[in-house]
């Protein structure tokens, strides 16, 4: 009895850019090939249970078949590799989810304020929707000291209130990093003395 998978798909957890091309490879295990009397010619690729046309397949060798998608437009694709076995039955080999999205844009319009007696809060424009989990981190430093990063919360991704106490009469440099599975970008740096950003109660 074949309990473990008959093969695998590479890459296993792909995150791809929307409207880009993507190739997946299904590799059959030899014991599975022997058991079912098949090779890579017998692989059937499916997305969300629909069979992909054979024109999109490439037989790499006796054990491996690839499928190529052009201009991916869906955010979430269930891709399965199956083999045609006895009596034209299909046996699932392996499945993956292709997640699509966009890399983050460079954050813009970074500005900070210090509410009197409170800690500094900065906000920015995070840019377009990426359809992916995108983390924004506010970075700040003096010429001689790096402050703790301020990680924006998921529900307020375009602002962050720092943990450290504000120090006045010394210039601070502040910028934002945006990162997701498709890339990492940094905003322009701003340089200011927090005393000029104080907002009276």
């Amino acid at each position: 009895e074949l309990l473990d998978p008959c093969g695998y798909i590479s890459p296993e957890s792909p995150v791809v850019q929307l409207h880009s091309n993507f190739t997946a490879v299904c590799v059959l295990k030899e014991k599975c090939m022997d058991y079912f009397h098949v090779n890579a010619n017998y692989i059937v690729w499916k997305t969300n249970h629909f069979t992909i046309p054979k024109e999109q397949y490439t037989i790499i060798n006796r054990t491996a078949s690839s499928v190529t998608f052009t201009d991916i437009a869906s955010l979430n694709i269930q891709l399965t590799c199956n083999i045609l076995t006895f009596g034209q039955l299909e046996q699932n080999v392996y499945g993956i989810t292709i997640i699509s999205g966009l890399p983050p844009e460079k954050p813009k319009n970074l500005s900070c304020i210090v509410n009197e007696g409170k800690k500094m809060r900065c906000e920015w424009d995070g840019g377009r929707e990426t359809h992916l989990e995108t983390n924004f981190t506010l970075k700040s430093e003096w010429a001689t000291h790096k402050f703790a990063d301020c990680k924006a919360k998921r529900d307020t991704p375009t602002s962050c209130t720092v943990d450290y106490s504000t120090v006045y009469f010394v210039n601070i440099e502040v910028w934002v990093e945006a990162e997701n599975a498709l890339g990492k970008v940094t905003s322009d740096h701003i340089n200011f003395d927090p005393v000029y950003k104080v907002k009276p109660n």
């Epitope: 090939m33 022997d34 009397h37 090779n39 010619n41 017998y42 006796r62 045609l84």
Partner: antibody
Framework: QVQLVQSGPEVKKPGSSVKVSCKAS????????ITWVRQAPGQGLEWMGV????????HYERKFQGRLTITMDESTSTAYMELSNLRSEDTAVYYC????????????WGQGTLVTVSS | DIQMTQSPSSLSASVGDRVTITCRAS??????LNWYQQKPGKAPKLLIY???SLQSGVPSRFSGSGSGTDFTLTISSLQPEDFATYYC??????????FGQGTRLEIK
């Protein structure tokens, strides 16, 4: 015990076609592939193409593309190899063989069919 | 396509000799290498498949080894009926499968 029995020798004129048959007996070829290999006089073995009955697909060596057609009649377990636009260099013994899908070895062979192309 | 190169192209040996034929692939083919014996006027006969597995009914004096690009067919003690032409064949690519050019084994 699988046996592959091929049709008899053929003498053909240049430009004509030849169709060689290969009948399987003593076993099913449902899960196997039928491969055609040829051997010119005094030469080595040359792969021509393969048919995969369960998929209804045939694959051909590039040099034969457009001239070679491999078909299968599953009701009679007979494979056919048709080569068109024959030339003198197609004179050879043509073999069919059962290919094991998983490993790609040819474990049963037909006896061979000599095709002579001569004007 | 994957090219297969056999060496030597011919060799002379005596009954009882140990004989080795080599086959080299132009790229790695894992263990997808098969060996055939062909006698004049006859169809080839499978001897070894998957580089080292002996086909049913083939005498144990035949053995195969190797993986990747370099493979060997060995006949441990040559018998009169072993004088024939031997071919290696790769089945890693599918299609096409490809054969070596053959090694003719003659009586010394």
């Amino acid at each position: 015990q699988v046996q592959l029995v091929q049709s008899g020798p053929e003498v053909k004129k240049p430009g004509s076609s030849v169709k060689v048959s290969c009948k399987a007996s003593g076993g099913t070829i449902d899960r196997n592939e039928i491969t055609w290999v040829r051997q010119a006089p005094g030469q080595g073995l040359e792969w021509m193409g393969v048919i995969i009955p369960i998929l209804g697909e045939a694959h051909y060596e590039r040099k034969f593309q457009g001239r070679l057609t491999i078909t299968m009649d599953e009701s009679t377990s007979t494979a056919y190899m048709e080569l068109s636009n024959l030339r003198s260099e197609d004179t050879a013994v043509y073999y069919c063989a059962r290919e094991r899908a998983a490993r790609g070895y040819l474990d049963y062979w037909g006896q061979g069919t000599l095709v002579t192309v001569s004007s | 396509d994957i090219q297969m190169t056999q060496s030597p192209s011919s060799l002379s040996a005596s009954v009882g000799d140990r004989v080795t034929i080599t086959c080299r692939a132009s790229q790695s083919i894992s263990s997808y290498l098969n060996w055939y014996q062909q006698k004049p006027g006859k169809a080839p006969k499978l001897l070894i498949y998957a580089a080292s597995s002996l086909q049913s009914g083939v005498p144990s004096r035949f053995s195969g080894s190797g993986s990747g690009t370099d493979f060997t067919l060995t006949i441990s003690s040559l018998q009169p009926e072993d004088f024939a032409t031997y071919y290696c064949q790769q089945s890693y690519s599918t299609p096409p499968i490809t054969f070596g050019q053959g090694t003719r084994l003659e009586i010394k």
